[in-house]
């Protein structure tokens, strides 16, 4: 009866899910296995979050305008092990937009959703940030290795989505 | 005072070459994004090409893109622009405009006097 | 690309009457509370000159009977009091993406 009812729950859930993401792919999680953590198809997960890499060249603001519309923001990257694993899907001759920006020049960046900016946990390629006029952050493939460097918001780059994992 | 003045426009066949100048002072020129616009006789403005203060980008338009070239020299305040293939649809005045950015673009704070590219046969 | 229609294409006004002039975007030229849209007068036989940036910021030395307002895709200049040097032709211009994009103009004479 309690496994009914508690699949009776998911299957609504899923339903309400569905309006806005056509498929999810779901994994067992919790001590007994109840739980279930899904992202949508084809993000991939990691941790508590899910990835979506976008290769639509657009502008920083229309990247994360594109991700808010699939309930997410453009990535806010808080770990080097979550940097490996999100750069294991990147291609190495592409640059991709980071939830990351300073738009009035001052040096002052700031996170997408609001997630303080700690010094202390970026991943800057060596001299960036260098330019007041370049905003916005990407994350790339240079001097064998993968690090952030700031361009310019409005010319058009890949992008990367993240949102909360769905859990029913 | 901010001041941008463009040489080298004139008369050119089809398929002609022209290397348009824009001399800039007043003004730290290596620290400002630049961009050339150009405004068709009786036509809207349009956006020709862009360099950023560094030198590390160059944006053009589909339409110009392959065949027109912008570059700087810092150490003698100019802006260039090299125009192959040229076409008589890129008959303009060619401006020079110094870029302000704003959040997360840019606006164009000053523009030269323009000069006058005319392309026929 | 992001195309930007003004309207009116001329317009006519007494001296010291307001007059308005629309640009609409395609797509919204906001984010958050940026409106990258902005506006340029130009007089026959000069180069463009900066009014407006911002969607409402008034550029230094611009007289304050200009004034900017909008977001998203609608934005209006206004001209509180029209005088005889304003008599010119008006460009939005946005700039939320490359390329930037120019509106068609306004022309704005004496009635």
């Known amino acids: 009866n309690f496994m009914y009812s508690k699949t009776v729950k998911r299957l609504s859930k899923l339903q309400e899910y569905q309006q806005y993401y056509p498929s999810l792919t779901c994994v067992m999680e919790g001590k007994d296995m109840e739980d279930w953590s899904c992202c949508p198809t084809p993000w991939t997960s990691f941790q508590s979050s899910c990835y979506f890499i976008s290769t639509v060249m657009q502008s920083w603001t229309k990247s994360q305008n594109n991700c808010s519309v699939m309930g997410a923001d453009l990535v806010v990257i808080n770990t080097k092990e979550e940097q490996d694993f999100i750069t294991q899907n990147l291609k190495i001759n592409s640059a991709y937009f980071l939830g990351l920006s300073d738009p009035k020049g001052w040096r002052h960046w700031q996170w997408v959703d609001q997630t303080p900016y700690n010094k202390n946990v970026t991943f800057w390629h060596s001299g960036e940030p260098n330019s007041p006029d370049e905003r916005c952050a990407i994350i790339n493939f240079r001097s064998e290795e993968w690090g952030w460097n700031d361009v310019h918001c409005h010319v058009p780059q890949k992008s990367i989505c993240k949102m909360k994992k769905i859990y029913i | 005072e901010v001041q941008l003045v463009e040489s080298g426009g004139g008369l050119v066949k089809p398929g002609g070459s022209l290397r348009l100048s824009c001399a800039a002072s007043?003004?730290?020129?290596?620290?400002?994004?630049m961009s050339w616009v150009r405004q068709a006789p009786g036509k809207r403005l349009e956006w020709v090409s862009t360099i950023s203060s560094g030198d590390s980008y160059t944006y053009y338009p589909d339409s110009v893109k392959g065949r027109f070239t912008i570059s700087r020299d810092n150490a003698k305040n100019s802006l260039y622009l090299q125009m192959n293939s040229l076409r008589a649809e890129d008959t303009a005045v060619y401006y020079c405009?110094?870029?302000?950015?704003?959040?997360?673009?840019?606006?164009?704070?000053?523009w030269g006097q323009g000069t006058t590219v005319t392309v026929s046969s | 690309d992001i195309v930007m229609t003004q309207s009116p294409d001329s317009l006519a006004v007494s001296l010291g009457e307001r007059a308005t002039i629309n640009c609409r975007a395609s797509?919204?030229?906001?984010?958050?509370?940026?409106?990258?849209m902005h506006w340029y007068q130009q007089k026959p036989g000069q180069p463009p000159k900066l009014l407006i940036y911002?969607?409402?910021n008034l550029e230094s030395g611009v007289p304050d009977r200009f004034s900017g307002s909008g977001s998203g895709t609608d934005f209006t200049l206004t001209i509180s009091s029209l005088q005889a040097e304003d008599v010119a032709v008006y460009y939005c211009q946005q700039s939320i993406e490359d390329p930037p994009t120019f509106g068609g103009g306004t022309k704005v004479e004496i009635k």
């Open positions: 405009a110094r870029q302000i950015y704003y959040d997360y673009a840019y606006y164009f704070d000053f």
């Open positions: 007043g003004f730290t020129f290596r620290s400002y994004g």
């Open positions: 911002g969607a409402s």
């Open positions: 797509e919204s030229v906001s984010f958050r509370t940026s409106h990258l």
